[in-house]
């Protein structure tokens, strides 16, 4: 009877279960009754990072210097290529795509430390009573608008993202 | 295209002054927070003033602050950096940089060396 499922490291096809090819090398064609898979090592910059049945490698990745990468660690037949920035910038995510001097905070928050050649900005989230509507790099959370002080009330509560509106007071007949 | 292009930058003497010019196109720059940054020889990338979209807040390096000024004129899409008391560790590559400050958005520079 043919199998329905296979061991780890195998794939079923055609009612038989074939060896997935090691990291590092392509599927050719799949394993017959009498053969079996054949796989070849990926070509120069290019990968396969797991057991698989792929018919092609992945190319590896471009550290691309126009947008401040460079090389932090070269690819293999099995592993990308790792990308970073050049010395004072930073990664804008985890995969490192593409290189900033220093992040910005985004609105709700504010910066706490500006940054340096060595470190990044540090943002901070406001907290209640202040606020930021801006994304900046050197710009704190502001304290919200104290309405009394003008001799307004407060018309319309405010956020981490937004000043409080102040209004005139209602006036008793 | 993001073009930011500096001038203004030449042989200054010590204690004199100087007022780069940076002209930006190619984005809607009374958005956009804008930054000096500079490279003095050899050495990394100081940040030295930044100043909001309006021009109502502005940030300052303490190693410049009361000396330099930033300002904007939206108008003209042109933002300004007016340094007096000028002293040898000024000499470096002025750049202006916008948000988000990003690797390609950047000018060629403008080189103030300042020497007797």
């Known amino acids: 009877e043919p199998p329905t499922a296979c061991r780890e490291k195998q794939y079923l096809i055609n009612s038989q279960c074939c060896s997935l090819c090691q990291p590092g090398q392509k599927l050719v064609s799949d394993c017959t009754e009498f053969t079996e898979t054949e796989c070849l090592p990926c070509g120069e910059s290019e990968f396969l990072d797991t057991w698989n049945r792929e018919t092609h490698c992945h190319q590896h990745k471009y550290c691309d210097p126009n947008l401040g990468l460079r090389v932090q660690q070269k690819g293999t037949s099995e592993t990308d290529t790792i990308c970073t920035c050049e010395e004072g910038w930073h990664c804008t995510s985890e995969a490192c795509e593409s290189c900033v001097l220093h992040r910005s905070c985004s609105p709700g928050f504010g910066v706490k430390q500006i940054a340096t050649g060595v470190s990044d900005t540090i943002c901070e989230p406001c907290p209640v009573g202040f606020f930021s509507n801006v994304s900046s790099a050197f710009e704190k959370c502001h304290p919200w608008t104290s309405c009394e002080t003008k001799d307004l009330v407060v018309q319309q509560a405010g956020t981490n993202k937004t000043d409080v509106v102040c209004g005139p007071q209602d006036r008793l007949r | 295209e993001v073009q930011l292009l500096e001038s203004g930058g030449g042989l200054v003497q010590p204690g004199g002054s100087r007022r780069l010019s940076c002209a930006a196109s190619?984005?809607?720059?009374?958005?956009?927070e804008m930054w000096w940054v500079r490279q003095a020889p050899g050495k990394g990338l100081e940040r030295v003033s930044?100043?909001?979209?309006?021009?109502?807040?502005?940030y300052y390096a303490d190693s410049v602050k009361g000396r330099f000024t930033i300002s904007r004129d939206n108008s003209k899409n042109t933002l300004y950096l007016q340094m007096n008391s000028l002293r040898a560790e000024d000499t470096a590559v002025y750049y202006c940089?916008?948000?988000?400050?990003?690797?390609?958005?950047w000018g060629q520079g403008t080189l103030v060396t300042v020497s007797s």
């Open positions: 940089a916008k948000l988000p400050f990003t690797f390609e958005d």
């Open positions: 930044a100043i909001n979209p309006q021009g109502t807040r502005t």
């Open positions: 190619g984005f809607t720059f009374r958005d956009y």
